[in-house]
Structure formats: C-alpha cells, structure tokens
Interface confidence: low
C-alpha cells in the first residue's frame, strides 16, 4: 500500500490559505501543474527540490504549486487568506506523536526519555557516530530532533549530550495513545488517519480508490477533514475508507478517554419521564413498545440478532430492556420479545413539551426548590458542598446553605437568568438548568424598563449599510473568520474573551474559526503590523433566548495601540433616549465597489415604547432588548455584521450597549434597529469571565 500510495493523504489541508514568508532567506520553488495531487507527490519524494519539502500551496487559479521547506509553525512565516490557494502541510512535521515504530516521525522533540538533551545529528561531540544527515537523506536528521531512521523497535531516539549516555529513546507517545474519544466517537475530531490494521485512510474529499457519499461539503458538521477517522453514521466507533483498493473501510483504533467527558454541544438533554426532541436523551424505564409487547434486552441476541449492544453504543445507556434511541431514530424504540416483530417504537412515552405540572420558577428563580439536577446541555450537576469555595469567590454574601441541598439546580447568587448549578466538568464549570419561568409570571428580573415581554423575532442578516469608513481607535472590534472568510463581528471585552452572536457559528468544529484583531480592512490588507490572529478554544452560549455567545480565545490578545478592550455597562442600567451611539461592521455596505473597510453608522437610542410604534406596533420589546434608530435614512446594521457592537458613550466612557443579532429589517427608513441589551446580560458576562479558566499569556 505504501508503494503505490497517493501521497496527498499525508498532508493536512487548510482551504483558502497560503503561507507568506516574512524571512526573505527562506526558499520556495514553484511550477505549473494540473492538480494538488501532483504537488503532493513531488513534495513527498522531494523530487527536483533543493530542500526538504514540508508543505506546499496549490494555486487553483494559476494551476501552480508552491513548495516550501517550512510550514505554518515555522518562524519567519505567516498564514494568509486567499480564495485561490489551498495549503497542504506534511502531517509528519506537525504531528506530535508516532505511528508504529515512528520511522516517519519528523517532529521537534529533542529530549530523551530521562530528560537528557539530544546531541545534534551533524555533530560528533560528545559521541562519534555514522548517522550523518547526508547518509540518511529523507530521514530528516535535522538539528537534534529525535528520529528513528532505521525503524528500530524502541521508537525515535537520539545520541545524548551527556558523555556518559551514548543514546537513549525519546518519550514520544503513540498516536493511538494520544487520541481518545467519548462514547462511540460521533463527536471525535482528532487526527487519527490510519485504521486499526495500519492502513492509511482515504481523504474524505477524494473518491479514489473508493467512491462514497460522505462528501465534506455535503456534511459540513461531520468534521470530514483530510483523511481523519470519523463516525458520521452512528457506527460503534470511528472508521474511514482506506487507500487499499481491496479494503473499502475499516475501524480505527481510538481508545476511550479516561474521564469520558462529552462535549457539551453533543450531549442530548437527559429526561426520565418524557421525551425531549427525538428522545436521544431519554433515560427512563419504560420497557414495552406502544402496544404493550415487552422489549428484548439490549445485551441479548434472542429473539432478534443485532449490533445495538451496550458495548457498541457505550454512552447510550442501553441498560436492561428499556426503550432508548441510540441511533437517531424518530423516537425511543427497542427490539421486541416477539420473534415476528423485530423493532417497535415506544410512542406511549409522553413528549416533555406536553407534560403538565412541569418544573418552573418565578422571578429569577432564587426561591426555586425543585429537584432538577441537570444543566441545559445535559451535564449532571455536582454537589453544592463541593463547590462552596468557588461560590464564595463570586458572591459577596453568605449563601443560604439550607437551600443548597444535594446537587439540585438553585440560584444562590441572584442570577437574573434563573437556576443553575456547578458541573464538575473543568471546561464548563457551571451552566443554567433547563427550567422555564412559570407561565404568566411577569415579575421583572430587572426594573425600570418600559416594556411588556415578548420573544425576539428573527429576520434578515445584518450589515452596516451606507456607513462612513472609520479610522478612529476601534481596537476592540473583532472579525470572526469562518473557514478563512469574515462571517461576523465581535467585541473584545477582555484579553481572552470576545462577545458576539449565536448565529455566527454554523459549524460545531472550533477549528473552523479564527478571530482577527487589530484590522481595519476585512482582508487584513495593510494591517500586517497590527493584525493578531487567534484561534478559538471555547464557545459559551448565553442564557436561553439571549442570542449571545462569549467566545474564548486560545491565547490572550496582546493589548497595544491597535488592539484594546471595550467596557461593559453596569448590570440593568438604562441609557437616556437620544444618546448618540454607533454600530460597526465589515458587512455589505450598499456600495458596488465595496472596499472592505470597517464602517460605522451613527444611531441614537430610542425608548422601547417609541421603538415599537416605529415598527408599526408589530413588535414589542422586552427587558433584554435595546433600540437605536438611524440619524441618516437607510443607515444601520445589515447582513454580515452580526455579533458586532452597538457602542455608546456616557460620561466620556465608551461601552458596548448592544450586540447586533438577526434583527427586524435592514436599513429601512423609519425602522430603528433592535439589539440585544448587553446591560441585561452584564452579570452573566462577568460571571463567565470570573469562573471560566483562560490560558495564561
């Protein structure tokens, strides 16, 4: 299989991306070709290249290869967006684990198992040897990096800088040890690219040697990146098509994570008495189908043989013979004990939406004493007594311990958005519980707002139309990029946190996103000196119905002349009518020859009552919304500016008072814009910043 391999499978692809060398001493080689596959083959074989090829870019417009002796992790190089470019990086140079004996390992570990620094391969001090880079071409005996040029048993090794120890193996883990998955790996997005028998996986975007239906563009949320193992179809574990023409597909050897913490976006809400959605989270004990026929045990193969076993579907709670929905069917079901009826739906289980006497809370739920003990994302609450230290850290009074029993959802800190609990998951320290306010409860959670309550309507996308190009200090303005393209705005409210809108995240895969800071041009042209590009490490969704997201950056932004934070308003504050404010965005501007520059549109605050009248009484605003009208006809937010801020100034302080979300019209004369009122959610924002761990700079 190695002999006739199509080498493009050995590369990690970053679409619409190229590498720009800042260091002019770095060499590159180019040539006209027809396909990226041709570039890959030449890069892998280093054929006719005056350097070791670590990456290449395929220029689709010019049908040209650019081969590089560096990759995106090298110094003197930066990534840049470009529609016509696709960047391919040799996985061997960016992998930090080994496959098999590690013969292909080309990473940068340079310390042995016992912690001794490696001797450079080109040096004979302190140990003389015959492993010269010139004698082992293609084995990448660079610097003093651990290598296994002969494919020996112990894995990558090196001569050591200690005269007493000639050589020693390096402690580089097997990729199969590093990679782990939860449940059956449906949410696995790791980098395993070979099967359990060692066959290399076929790229998902290729149809050779095996034609298939799982096209990445057709299933954008399945994580079909490069040729990594995935589980898009509810199999017992991740798998891939292989490069072996005789083996269509095979499972991959990915172990189950030790703590088995599920990604919160993938966990269905667990219920025991009723069905939420399709009932994937149903964990009750109903064990007959709709007509009373008893269910067959999941761990039994009689009377019906099947592969829906507890071993194959680890997190689906296939206990006893209870109705479950492990495979995304329309509702919970089971195999039946009647040999003539293989499966049946348990449609007698009521729908949660219809069940009466459901849990609810009044006001902000500070007196809620129900016994729900699960967050909205399905995580089990952890005991209050284990979390008192954390609780004391963000409230300035002694909580009522008599209310904080067991792990029930509570509201000890007077949170405006209802009961919550700690989770025990370090990534999601706490979250709200799926309890609604009681029907007919109109107790305001904050006072002084002129409004009845109604949910927000969602219509068109928003972009700043007919705005004026801005060059003032707007260092807090963030361009959120999705697959290398601007998709939304955002506001940097803390070095590691960006406030934006829920609608900005079409995919669950955080690798799809980047935050660009310090730019004025949407493509970053002319902003090279000031631009910061940061990855996204977590999304924290706002309280139910808020449309807000706090986006955590993988590392803190560096505050300088071009990047700054913007202040938040005080919780529950109101700003006087006619206060002058501005909205910012890079969205479509109504101009034919759009220059891609950040625009600003000036608006003024309007009371909720008056705002409702301007919308011909078709909308009523609630305490979580704020309204601002344009000074200029047809000027205001429009498509593509979601997540961006409504910025107002009061007492010489600029702050983000609103967030642009899909609103009620796009730059329509006499139609003011309706924004999420940040003041209503300020406590939530502060609480997240205080309680969620962020990386240190």
């Amino acid at each position: 299989q190695r002999k006739r391999r199509n080498t493009i499978h050995e590369f990690k692809k970053s679409a619409k991306t190229t590498l720009i060398k800042i260091d002019p001493a770095l060499k590159i080689k180019t040539k006209k070709v027809n396909t990226a596959d041709q570039c890959a083959n030449r890069c892998t074989r280093n054929k006719g290249l005056p350097f070791t090829c670590k990456a290449f870019v395929f220029d689709k417009a010019r049908k040209q290869c650019l081969w590089f002796p560096f990759n995106s992790m090298s110094s003197g190089v930066k990534k840049e967006f470009g529609h016509e470019f696709d960047l391919y990086e040799n996985k061997d140079y960016i992998r930090n684990c080994i496959i098999g004996k590690g013969r292909s390992y080309k990473g940068t570990v340079s310390i042995t198992k016992s912690g001794i620094k490696c001797q450079p391969w080109s040096s004979m001090i302190p140990h003389e040897h015959s492993f010269l880079p010139s004698s082992y071409r293609g084995k990448d005996l660079q610097e003093n990096y651990c290598r296994n040029p002969r494919g020996e048993e112990g894995g990558p090794w090196c001569f050591t800088s200690n005269p007493e120890v000639r050589y020693e193996v390096c402690d580089i883990p097997q990729c199969s040890e590093v990679e782990c998955m939860t449940c059956n790996g449906e949410s696995y997005r790791g980098l395993m690219d070979h099967t359990e028998s060692g066959k290399i996986c076929q790229r998902w975007d290729h149809q050779t040697p095996h034609r298939h239906k799982f096209l990445p563009e057709r299933y954008p949320d399945k994580g079909f990146d490069d040729n990594y193992c995935r589980n898009p179809d509810g199999q017992p574990r991740p798998w891939c098509y292989t490069l072996d023409p005789h083996t269509r597909w095979e499972y991959c050897a990915i172990k189950t994570c030790a703590d088995n913490t599920m990604n919160d976006t993938d966990v269905p809400l667990e219920t025991t008495e009723c069905i939420q959605g399709q009932g994937e989270g149903y964990r009750g004990t109903v064990n007959t189908i709709w007509n009373g026929i008893p269910c067959q045990r999941w761990d039994s193969q009689y009377p019906h043989e099947h592969d829906m076993t507890p071993e194959n579907f680890k997190c689906k709670d296939l206990r006893e013979n209870y109705c479950r929905n492990p495979d995304g069917s329309e509702s919970p079901w089971c195999f039946t004990t009647d040999p003539n009826i293989r499966v049946g739906y348990c449609s007698q289980i009521p729908n949660c939406d219809m069940s009466h006497g459901q849990d609810c809370y009044r006001g902000n739920g500070k007196n809620y004493m129900g016994n729900l003990s699960q967050t909205r994302s399905g995580l089990t609450c952890s005991m209050w007594d284990k979390n008192m230290e954390d609780l004391h850290r963000h409230i300035f009074w002694e909580p009522d311990a008599s209310k904080l029993n067991e792990n029930y959802c509570r509201n000890p800190d007077d949170d405006a958005h209802g009961p919550w609990c700690y989770t025990g998951n370090p990534l999601i320290p706490w979250d709200y519980c799926p309890i609604s306010r009681c029907e007919g409860d109109t107790t305001p959670t904050i006072v002084n707002l002129d409004h009845p309550v109604i949910s927000c309507a969602k219509t068109k996308q928003l972009r700043v139309v007919n705005g004026i190009p801005t060059r003032t200090n707007i260092g807090w303005m963030v361009s959120l990029r999705y697959r290398n393209k601007h998709i939304c705005g955002g506001s940097l409210i803390k070095e590691s946190w960006v406030l934006t809108a829920r609608q900005c995240f079409p995919s669950r895969d955080l690798k799809d996103y980047e935050a660009w800071l310090g730019i004025h041009d949407v493509h970053g042209r002319g902003d090279e000196k000031c631009k910061q590009v940061l990855n996204v490490s977590q999304l924290v969704y706002g309280p139910e119905g808020s449309d807000l997201v706090l986006m955590k950056l993988a590392r803190p932004a560096v505050l300088d002349d071009f990047v700054s934070t913007i202040d938040l308003p005080n919780y529950g504050c109101t700003i006087p009518e006619k206060t002058s404010c501005s909205v910012y965005g890079w969205g479509y501007t109504g101009l034919i020859n759009y220059d891609g520059l950040l625009r600003v549109a000036h608006l003024y605050i309007m009371g909720n009552e008056k705002c409702s009248q301007h919308h011909r009484g078709k909308v009523t605003l609630n305490e979580s919304e704020i309204c601002a009208g344009a000074e200029k006809i047809g000027s205001g937010p429009c498509e593509g500016d979601y997540g961006g801020p409504l910025v107002c100034e009061q007492h010489k302080m600029r702050m983000v008072l609103g967030v642009i979300v899909p609103g009620r019209g796009c730059a329509i004369p006499n139609r003011p814009g309706i924004f999420v009122r940040v003041a209503y959610y300020a406590k939530w924002i502060h609480k997240i910043i205080l309680t969620y761990k962020v990386p240190q700079s």
Epitope: R211, K213, W249, V343
Partner: antibody, heavy 117, light 112 residues
Framework: VEESGGRLVTPGTPLTLTCTVS????????MGWVRQAPGKGLEYIGM?????RAWYATWAKGRFTISKTSPTVDLKITSPTTEDTATYFC????????????????WGQGTLVTVSS | QVLTQTPSPVSAAVGGTVTINCQGS????????FSWYQQKPGQPPKLLIY???TLASGVPSRFKGSGSGTQFTLTISGVQCADAATYYC?????????????FGGGTEVVVK
C-alpha cells in the same frame, strides 16, 4: 422483496401496501417505493431510512405514508384518486457505503392498485 | 427536476450499437449520482449502471455509462436480442433538506 395488498379500491378509501423482505436486515438497508402507471414510466414516491425516518418526493408528501416494522415496509395511500392507479414496486437501496448515490439494486415484482368508482 | 430521455423508441440490428441520452434540467447534487435501469414487459426494473459509469454486479460489459453534470449517456455495443427492453435513467438532485430522486421517461429499444 415481495409486495402485497394491491387491489381495486374506490377513490378516497385508504389503502396500505406491504413489502415483505427476507434475507435483508432493515436496520442496515433503506427501502424505497416506486410506482408505474399502466404504459407509463417509473415515478419515485419515497423511501424509509435505516433509522425509520421516511422521506418523500415533493409531490408525494401528504398523499403517502411509509413506515416499517421488520421484516415489512408499508406504504399507505391516504386518499387514493384515479391517478394513483399503478403498479407499486418496493425496492432496496444500495448500502450507504457502496455508493454515494441513491440506487435501487433489488426490486420486488410489484403489486397492482386500481382506483375506480 | 426533470430528466429527458432521447430518442424513443430506438431500434438497432443485432450486433449494432445503441446510444440513449438523458438530459437533466439541473445539475445533480454530485456529478455522478446517476443510474440506468432496464425493464422488460411484466417485470420489475433491473439495475444496470450506477454512479454514472459503474457496472452493477452481473451486468454484461457491453453496457457502458458515461457523462456528468446534466448530460448522461447509456451505450449498448454488440446489441443482442435479450437487450430489447425499456431503459430508464435516474438522477439524484439536491432538494431542500433531502435528496430528490427522479426517473427519466424511458426509452424503448427495439432489436431487429
């Protein structure tokens, strides 16, 4: 794959056709229904996936209901009209992993439905 | 989405070649999501070709499929008496949140 239940019905009288499979695990294969009016071409009605979810051709939505309880797949014609007179075929779709297309690789002989007053 | 088959009917002598075209009103969701079926009187259709050019199991190699996008062709070379039948093309189109399947109107092949 064997269809049954075809008969003469009056307009508006609901009719359920049954497709019985043997040697096919319905938890691994999707099944589809296709019809053919006398002397006319094939017309796709809909299919039921391995997880029990049904999809329909745009024109067939509301007029037909597909369901399954292994080893049978049912097609219910909710309110037949004379235009529904046809031979109804039940067919297996090739396994998802063999091709990316919806392809009917195994067909029953069909069952004739006549709608007439 | 409409699939138009031409010509119909088509006749060929034993040993000759028959070409049937199928034109789509819009592109398929994937260039190759296309199949050909053979149906003889009183029988159900039989799969000949899928993915535009892949021969189904047990189908003689004289049947050949080609084309992509909106234009597809079935060629029968070295026609035999047993090939007298009606041939249907079938394409899969993107249609809202599901895939729509459509059949062509059929082409009758008469063997002389």
């Amino acid at each position: 794959v064997e269809e049954s239940g075809g008969r003469l019905v009056t307009p508006g009288t609901p009719l359920t056709l049954t497709c019985t499979v043997s040697g096919i695990d319905l938890s691994n294969y999707a099944m589809g229904w296709v019809r053919q009016a006398p002397g006319k071409g094939l017309e796709y009605i809909g299919m039921i996936g391995v997880n029990g979810r049904a999809w329909y051709a745009t024109w067939a939505k509301g007029r037909f209901t597909i369901s399954k309880t292994s080893p049978t797949v049912d097609l219910k014609i909710t309110s037949p009209t004379t235009e529904d007179t046809a031979t109804y075929f039940c067919a297996r779709l090739i396994d998802e992993r063999s091709t990316y297309s919806y392809v009917f690789d195994l067909w029953g002989q069909g069952t004739l439905v006549t709608v007439s007053s | 989405q409409v699939l138009t088959q031409t010509p119909s009917p088509v006749s060929a002598a034993v040993g000759g070649t028959v070409t049937i075209n199928c034109q789509g009103s819009q592109s398929l969701y994937n260039n190759n999501a296309f199949s050909w079926y053979q149906q003889k009187p009183g029988q159900p259709p039989k799969l000949l070709i899928y993915d535009a050019s892949t021969l189904a199991s047990g189908v003689p190699s004289r049947f050949k499929g080609s084309g992509s996008g909106t234009q597809f062709t079935l060629t029968i070379s070295g026609v035999q008496c047993a090939d007298a039948a009606t041939y249907y093309c079938q394409g899969e189109f993107s249609c809202g949140d599901v895939d729509c399947i459509a059949f062509g109107g059929g082409t009758e092949v008469v063997v002389k």
